[in-house]
């Protein structure tokens, strides 16, 4: 008799999810000497243990603690780049500016980037058919809780000047409901972080507006200032420059240090 399976509103687990996580872990630890000590099988076991056999609407940050422990990584706290709604450009930037790091440049972020996963209560199966949608089903799902957990830890680790890349082409340049707006902003530590500098990336070729005067940026400034962190905002007008450097990664001079 076929077992009844809960139908969720979101896409199911990414195909070949276990193999993908394991392969990414092996690749990452080969490229990053400081993480060579990591046992990727143990990482996968801890990842799996966070959501397998658990109700996918009842996941907690505690479920991910064994994985967090295994994935503990030290990145230079003054070289952190946060982003909101502009992931690809942020990643292009750190691909060139090798001494800056997004969350997805860390082991745990790299493992889960662009993947979906969930299990089922009381079975060891991975659900490849559907997973809970954050809005339509529940917020405490395996993917959302994972990103909330790693994002909080990443923000807590930041120090000195922290940069955030924001999408100037969106109606809400700063969105309180984004991971940046709801998690990272509130977990920057005022005793460690001196300034949050926002880079508002313009899309249009002829765009010469001052998007740092946007009401949502003023809202971000207000939130940050109330947390006793200084705020700075810069208009960035030529994002195509990032791509030009990415196309020629062998050019060591294509970094912001001159």
């Amino acid at each position: 008799v076929p077992r009844w399976r809960q139908q969720w509103s979101g896409p199911g687990t990414t195909k070949r999810f276990p193999e993908t996580v394991l392969a990414r872990c092996v690749k990452y630890t080969e490229i990053h000497p400081e993480m060579r000590h990591v046992d990727c099988q143990s990482v996968w076991d801890a990842f799996k243990g966070a959501f397998i056999s658990k109700h996918p609407c009842n996941i907690t940050e505690e479920d991910y603690q064994p994985l967090m422990k295994l994935g503990t990584q030290t990145v230079p706290c003054n070289k952190i780049l946060l982003w909101s709604r502009i992931k690809d450009l942020a990643h292009q930037f750190t691909q060139v500016q090798r001494d800056m790091f997004t969350l997805e440049d860390t082991l745990l972020g790299y493992l889960a980037d662009d993947l979906t996963w969930c299990g089922e209560f009381n079975t060891s199966k991975i659900n490849y058919q559907s997973c809970p949608d954050w809005r339509k089903d529940c917020s405490n799902n395996p993917v959302s809780v994972f990103w909330k957990t790693v994002s909080r830890r990443f923000a807590e680790a930041a120090c000195d000047v922290v940069h955030v890349m924001l999408n100037g082409s969106r109606s809400k340049i700063f969105d309180k409901n984004s991971t940046f707006g709801s998690v990272e902003v509130h977990n920057l530590q005022p005793e460690k972080v001196q300034t949050l500098e926002a880079w508002v990336i313009h899309g249009g070729r002829e765009d010469s507006r001052d998007l740092c005067q946007d009401p949502t940026i003023k809202e971000l400034e207000s939130i940050i200032s109330k947390r006793n962190i200084q705020f700075s905002c810069k208009n960035i007008y030529r994002p195509d420059k990032f791509l030009q450097c990415v196309k020629n990664p062998e050019d060591s001079s294509c970094t912001s240090e001159i």
Epitope: F93, V96, Q97, W199, H202, R205, E206, D207, S208, R209, D210, C212, Q213, S232, C233, K234, N235, I236, Y237, R238, D240, K241, F242, Q244, C245, K247, N248, E250, D251, S253, C254, T255, S256, I258
Partner: antibody
Framework: QVQLVESGGGLVQPGGSLRLSCAAS????????MNWVRQAPGKGLEWVSG????????YYADSVKGRFTISRDNSKNTLYLQMNSLRAEDTAVYYC?????????????WGQGTLVTVSS | DIELTQPPSVSVAPGQTARISCSGD??????VYWYQQKPGQAPVLVIY???KRPSGIPERFSGSNSGNTATLTISGTQAEDEADYYC??????????FGGGTKLTVLR
């Protein structure tokens, strides 16, 4: 090391044309925006034109728009400025300048300049 | 378009601190660059991104940018620092602007 060498300057009559060249070396030319900046005798710096690395995007100061054309040949590592309908006020030393990368839009490296004199 | 305003001249005694200002509407929202130009020579970038110093530029050069004003500071000014100084910013599209320049005189 980065080198920019301008050529093509000289004396030209009002209404005449001139083409400036800038030979670049010491970096991956196609990765960078390139620019022309000028300086009239005894005056300050004035940005004239810029071009993206690929070279799909071109930009011009209002004072030269419609008269000057910037272009580049990435296979030859060379930047050009075609100047038409020249006026006395275009008299200046013309510098070729390489843009800073990524989030910065300033000039990391400059050539030594080539003098353009527009006079009858 | 933003307009950048600099004082035409600044004088300083050797070993003292020189400050050159550059003002423009909401200048803090844009990165500012500073160039040094000596007679008969091409400009040289001394500060980029408000406060970053290119390699080879002495530590006595520093920059800041807040409110409507960016400032180039030269501490322990030396005779060789006598030159014209230009600020510059970029406000999108074809709006790349320089300040009018400041002549720095090191008193003898």
């Amino acid at each position: 090391q980065v080198q920019l060498v301008e050529s093509g300057g000289g004396l030209v009559q009002p209404g005449g044309s001139l083409r400036l060249s800038c030979a670049a070396s010491g970096f991956t030319f196609s990765s960078y925006y390139m620019n022309w900046v000028r300086q009239a005798p005894g005056k300050g710096l004035e940005w004239v034109s810029g071009i993206s690395g690929d070279p799909s995007n071109t930009y011009y100061a209002d004072s030269v728009k419609g008269r000057f054309t910037i272009s580049r040949d990435n296979s030859k590592n060379t930047l050009y400025l075609q100047m038409n309908s020249l006026r006395a006020e275009d008299t200046a030393v013309y510098y070729c300048a390489r843009d800073l990368p990524l989030v910065y839009t300033g000039f990391a490296y400059w050539g030594q300049g080539t003098l353009v004199t527009v006079s009858s | 378009d933003i307009e950048l305003t600099q004082p035409p001249s600044v004088s300083v005694a050797p070993g003292q601190t020189a400050r050159i200002s550059c003002s423009g509407d909401n200048l803090r929202h844009y990165y500012v660059y500073w160039y040094q130009q000596k007679p008969g020579q091409a400009p040289v970038l001394v500060i980029y991104g408000d406060s970053k110093r290119p390699s080879g530029i002495p530590e006595r050069f520093s920059g800041s940018n807040s409110g409507n004003t960016a400032t180039l500071t030269i501490s322990g000014t030396q005779a060789e620092d006598e030159a014209d100084y230009y600020c510059q910013t970029y406000t999108g599209g074809a709006s790349l602007v320089f300040g009018g320049g400041t002549k720095l005189t090191v008193l003898r």
